[in-house]
């Protein structure tokens, strides 16, 4: 968590920001809330980015005003603008690229003040990974796939019965690149698994932890999967 | 209600040029993007391009390049698609349709009536 | 630029019945895939939106999945006015780009 104040003729503001990533391909957004004022017209938004010329997005007096905005954001960016009156400045990003990670300024102006706060943001892909019985390996065998991950993760097993064992002799994990080149599908295969135990598939890398787990039993398979982004502070 | 009503049907001669107009109201002009598509008799949608009322910002399908203008004008609400040097093969219905999202640029969610344009010699 | 391969190009299916409509991009991955229905000399009415988002006032029946390359439109059980054209909308990248179109018709 981040938090900013003003520090210019008029009174500061609190803005606080939180880190987040972005999953390439689909929607991110960049959270910012600040103290709210009761007249809209009287709120300015800034989105900006380091190392980028243009604004990021740009909304002041109820609306969207876009003429500064730079053309790696065109058609791409909204806040959400029916809760800005009540202190939300957040951004919407559309189809997140790798390039969009950086560090952005969520700056603020009311009639109460001026704010701002940085944001971390974080590029790359990461999805649930599901936890199935391999029938037709010769012996019993697990296998964990998940669709997108991005830097290549690391992926270790563990289980309920064998707590604090290494798998990583009985397991085997492959990387299969994309059709898109850039993200990764993760599969992971562990043998030589018991009965009446729950084993778990956990894939991490720098923007986030997922795990599925999975229990055998002689009657039944049950199945759960979760995922955790690793960087949200605020500031 | 979000409402997109286009100009009437036009009937052209090859190599002359034609202007559809889309009024819109019922929404914030200025706040959303505005595309073009159009259909050939039987044929399937094809995207002419956008613009961002807001700020004038256009993209247009590489095919059409050089040949479509996509301009607005925020006095009236309106957007126009101006199609030149046509021909036979320009013949088709042509749509307008706001694109959700505000800023961002959205599928299109609300259409108009479409407008036929003919080219005929 | 992306293209958007649509199949099949019309299919016969009576009411009732489960269909299914699959849209290839060319190449990327993004789920901004929308789908929609058009009938004859109506305008196109957008269905689903972001793979999977509902429009609102689209009934259930109605649903889309998909990821990486691969996009699908499934109807669990045709009604009547169903039968309409089908059309896959690719609109993540700057170019847009439509399916070819499925014509979903009576048997």
């Known amino acids: 968590l981040i938090i900013g104040f003003g520090i210019s003729g008029r009174h500061s503001i609190t803005v606080t920001t939180v880190a987040s990533a972005g999953n390439i391909g689909e929607d991110g957004i960049l959270s910012c809330t600040f103290e709210p004022d009761i007249k809209l017209s009287d709120i300015v938004i800034q989105w900006l980015k380091e190392g980028v010329l243009g604004l990021v997005h740009e909304f002041k007096e109820g609306k969207d005003e876009l003429s500064e905005q730079d053309e790696m954001f065109r058609g791409r960016t909204a806040v959400f603008a029916d809760q800005v009156i009540v202190g939300n400045a957040s951004l919407r990003l559309k189809n997140v690229q790798l390039t969009d990670a950086g560090t952005y300024k969520c700056y603020i102006i009311t009639s109460k003040g001026k704010g701002n706060a940085n944001l971390e943001y974080k590029t790359g892909a990461f999805s649930m990974p599901e936890v199935n019985v391999d029938y037709n390996a010769s012996s019993e065998t697990l296998r964990c796939e998940a669709p997108r991950w991005f830097p290549q993760p690391t992926v270790v097993w563990a289980s309920q019965v064998d707590q604090g064992a290494n798998f990583s002799e009985v397991s085997n994990t492959s990387f299969e690149l994309n059709s898109e080149n850039v993200t990764m599908k993760v599969v992971s295969v562990l043998y030589n698994v018991t009965i009446n135990n729950t084993y778990s598939c956990m894939i991490e890398n720098d923007i986030a932890k997922a795990t599925g787990d999975i229990k055998v039993t002689e009657s039944e398979i049950k199945r759960r999967s979760h995922l955790q982004l690793l960087n949200s502070k605020a500031s | 209600e979000v409402q997109l009503v286009q100009s009437g049907a036009e009937v052209k001669k090859p190599g002359a040029s034609v202007k559809v107009s889309c009024k819109a109201s019922?929404?914030?002009?200025?706040?959303?993007?505005i595309g073009w598509v159009r259909q050939a008799p039987g044929q399937g949608l094809e995207w002419i391009g956008d613009?961002?009322?807001?700020?004038?910002?256009?993209n247009y399908n590489e095919k059409f390049k050089g040949r479509a203008t996509i301009t607005a004008d925020t006095s009236t609400s309106t957007a126009y698609l101006e199609l030149s040097s046509l021909r036979s093969e320009d013949t088709a219905v042509y749509y307008c349709?706001?694109?959700?999202?505000?800023?961002?640029?959205?599928?299109?969610?609300?259409w108009g009536q479409g407008t036929l344009v003919t080219v005929s010699s | 630029d992306i293209q958007m391969t649509q199949s099949p190009s019309s299919l016969s299916a009576s009411v009732g019945d489960r269909v299914t409509i699959t849209c290839k991009a060319s190449?990327?991955?993004?789920?901004?895939v929308a789908w929609y229905q058009q009938k004859p000399g109506k305008a196109p009415k957008l269905l689903i939106h972001?793979?999977?988002t509902l429009q609102p006032g689209v009934p259930s029946r109605f649903s889309g999945s998909g990821s990486g390359r691969d996009y699908t439109l499934t109807i669990s059980s045709l009604q009547p006015e169903d039968f309409a054209t089908y059309y896959c909308?690719?609109?993540?990248?700057?170019?847009?780009?439509f399916g070819q179109g499925t014509k979903v018709e009576i048997k």
């Open positions: 349709a706001r694109l959700d999202g505000s800023s961002y640029r959205g599928a299109m969610d609300s």
């Open positions: 019922g929404y914030t002009f200025t706040s959303y993007w």
């Open positions: 613009i961002y009322p807001g700020g004038g910002y256009t």
């Open positions: 190449q990327g991955f993004n789920k901004y």
């Open positions: 972001y793979t999977s």
């Open positions: 909308l690719q609109y993540g990248n700057l170019l847009y780009a």
